[in-house]
C-alpha cells in the first residue's frame, strides 16, 4: 500500500495497527514504558517502523500536542552534527545541547533536547500504515 514512498511521505491509508495513532499519512506509536535509545530503535525496527524522524516544524508542532514534560526518544543523533536516522541534517529546529557526551535526541512538549543515550525514556515510533518497506 505504501511501497515506493520516500522517507517523508506515505500514501493515504485507512488505519493503523492497534495502539498506534494515525496522524496525517503516518502512524505513530507513543510508548508507555521506557528504554534506552538503542533499545527504543530496536523496538521500532522490529515493528517495521523507525524511531520518529520529524520532517518539518509543522509535524513537530502537531506531535508536541500529544507530549508532556516527559522526554521521548526520537530518531536523532549527534554524529559529527545532529542528523536524523534517515541521514538528513537537523535544520528546521534547534536542539538544547552543550555536552559532548549527550549524543541522542529526545523531544517533549517544549522542544528537542540532547541526552545521554543510555537514559531510559519513553519513545515514539513512526511508520506508514501496514507498510513493510517504506520506513521513513
Amino acid at each position: 500500500l505504501c511501497q515506493g514512498s520516500n522517507y517523508s511521505t506515505c500514501a493515504s491509508c485507512p488505519s493503523c495497527p492497534d495502539r498506534w495513532m494515525k496522524y496525517g499519512n503516518h502512524c505513530y506509536y507513543f510508548s508507555v514504558e521506557e528504554k534506552d535509545w538503542n533499545s527504543s530503535l530496536e523496538f521500532c525496527l522490529a515493528r517495521d517502523s523507525h524511531l520518529l524522524v520529524i520532517t518539518d516544524n509543522q509535524e513537530m508542532s502537531l506531535l508536541q500536542v500529544f507530549l508532556s514534560e516527559a522526554f521521548c526518544w526520537i530518531g536523532l543523533r549527534n554524529n559529527s552534527g545532529w542528523r536524523w536516522e534517515d541521514g538528513s541534517p537537523l535544520n528546521f529546529s534547534r536542539i538544547s545541547s552543550n555536552s559532548f557526551v549527550q549524543t541522542c535526541g529526545a523531544i517533549n512538549k517544549n522542544g528537542l533536547q540532547a541526552s545521554s543515550c543510555e537514559v531510559p525514556l519513553h519513545w515514539v515510533c513512526k511508520k506508514c500504515p501496514f507498510a513493510d518497506q517504506a520506513l521513513f
Epitope: 522526554f71 555536552s99 549527550q102 545521554s116 543510555e118 537514559v119
Partner: antibody
Framework: QVILKESGPGILQPSQTLSLTCSFS??????????IGWIRHPSGKALEWLAH???????SYNSALKSRLTISKDTSKNQVFLRLANVATADTATYYC?????????????????WGQGTSVTVSS | DVLLTQTPLSLPVSLGDQASISCRSS???????????LEWYLLKPGQSPKLLIF???NRFSGVPDKFSGSGSGTDFTLKIRRVEAEDLGIYYC?????????FGAGTKLELK
C-alpha cells in the same frame, strides 16, 4: 561556553560551618540531564566526591560525610551551594564544583566535562 | 564502596617515552545498563582537573589521540604516547557505575 566558579571563605575555624557557592554560566540547571557536583582535593591526597544535585532537585551525598553536608541550588541565579558543618582540620582542601551528566541513575553520574578553578579552604584554629 | 587502585603511584618518565597507568577496581564496574563508567582525569599544578577519557576508551573533546584508554570489568589502562612536558601531572581514574562514585589515589607522572 560553560564556565563554573567557586567561592568560599578561605579560612575558618574548627567546628564552624563551611559555606561554598558555585556560580555557573553557559547552561541551565533546569535542563534535563544536567547536574553539578562538588569534589575536593586535600593537598597530597586523592580527589574526593562530596555531593551533587540534579536539574530535578534530586541530591546525593558522600555517605561518610552525609550528616555534615547540605547541597542546594538557586536556578534563577545559576548557583549551587554546599554547606559542610562542624569542620575540622581534615577538611582543609581545594574545593571544586563540576558539571555532571545524568545517565539514568540519580545517585551517581559520569563525565565531569567542565570544572571550576577551585577555591582553597583552610581550617585552622 | 568501589575501591580503585592505581599503579604506579609515581611514574618517572623521559620526554618522548610512552607512559602506562593501571587502574584496578575492587569489583566489576559494568553498570546494569551495559556501560562502564570509567574515566580518566588529569590534574596539573595550579589548574582544575580535566576530563581525558570517558566510558573506558572515549576521548573527550579536544583530547589528542596520544591518550588512549582500554580495559574491561575490573582492569583498566591509560596510555600516553610520546610524553611531553605539558602531560605531566597527576592522573586519576574515576568510576561512576556504582554508588558512591569514587576516584583512584592518583598517579603522578613526572620527569626522571
Amino acid at each position: 561556553q560553560v564556565i563554573l566558579k567557586e567561592s568560599g571563605p578561605g579560612i575558618l575555624q574548627p567546628s564552624q560551618t563551611l559555606s561554598l557557592t558555585c556560580s555557573f554560566s553557559g547552561f541551565s540547571l533546569t535542563t534535563f540531564g544536567m547536574g553539578i557536583g562538588w569534589i575536593r582535593h586535600p593537598s597530597g591526597k586523592a580527589l574526593e566526591w562530596l555531593a551533587h544535585i540534579w536539574w530535578n532537585d534530586d541530591k546525593s551525598y558522600n555517605s561518610a560525610l552525609k550528616s555534615r553536608l547540605t547541597i542546594s541550588k538557586d536556578t534563577s541565579k545559576n548557583q549551587v551551594f554546599l554547606r559542610l558543618a562542624n569542620v575540622a582540620t581534615a577538611d582543609t582542601a581545594t574545593y571544586y564544583c563540576a558539571r555532571t551528566i545524568y545517565y539514568g541513575n540519580y545517585l551517581t553520574f559520569y563525565a565531569m566535562e567542565h570544572w571550576g578553578q577551585g577555591t582553597s579552604v583552610t581550617v585552622s584554629s | 564502596d568501589v575501591l580503585l587502585t592505581q599503579t604506579p603511584l609515581s611514574l618517572p618518565v623521559s620526554l618522548g617515552d610512552q607512559a602506562s597507568i593501571s587502574c584496578r577496581s575492587s569489583q566489576n564496574i559494568v553498570h546494569s545498563n551495559g556501560n562502564t563508567y570509567l574515566e580518566w582525569y588529569l590534574l596539573k599544578p595550579g589548574q582544575s582537573p580535566k576530563l581525558l577519557i570517558f566510558k573506558v576508551s572515549n576521548r573527550f573533546s579536544g583530547v589528542p589521540d596520544k591518550f588512549s584508554g582500554s580495559g574491561s570489568g575490573t582492569d583498566f589502562t591509560l596510555k600516553i604516547r610520546r610524553v611531553e612536558a605539558e602531560d605531566l601531572g597527576i592522573y586519576y581514574c574515576f568510576q561512576g557505575s556504582h554508588v558512591p562514585p569514587t576516584f583512584g589515589a592518583g598517579t603522578k607522572l613526572e620527569l626522571k
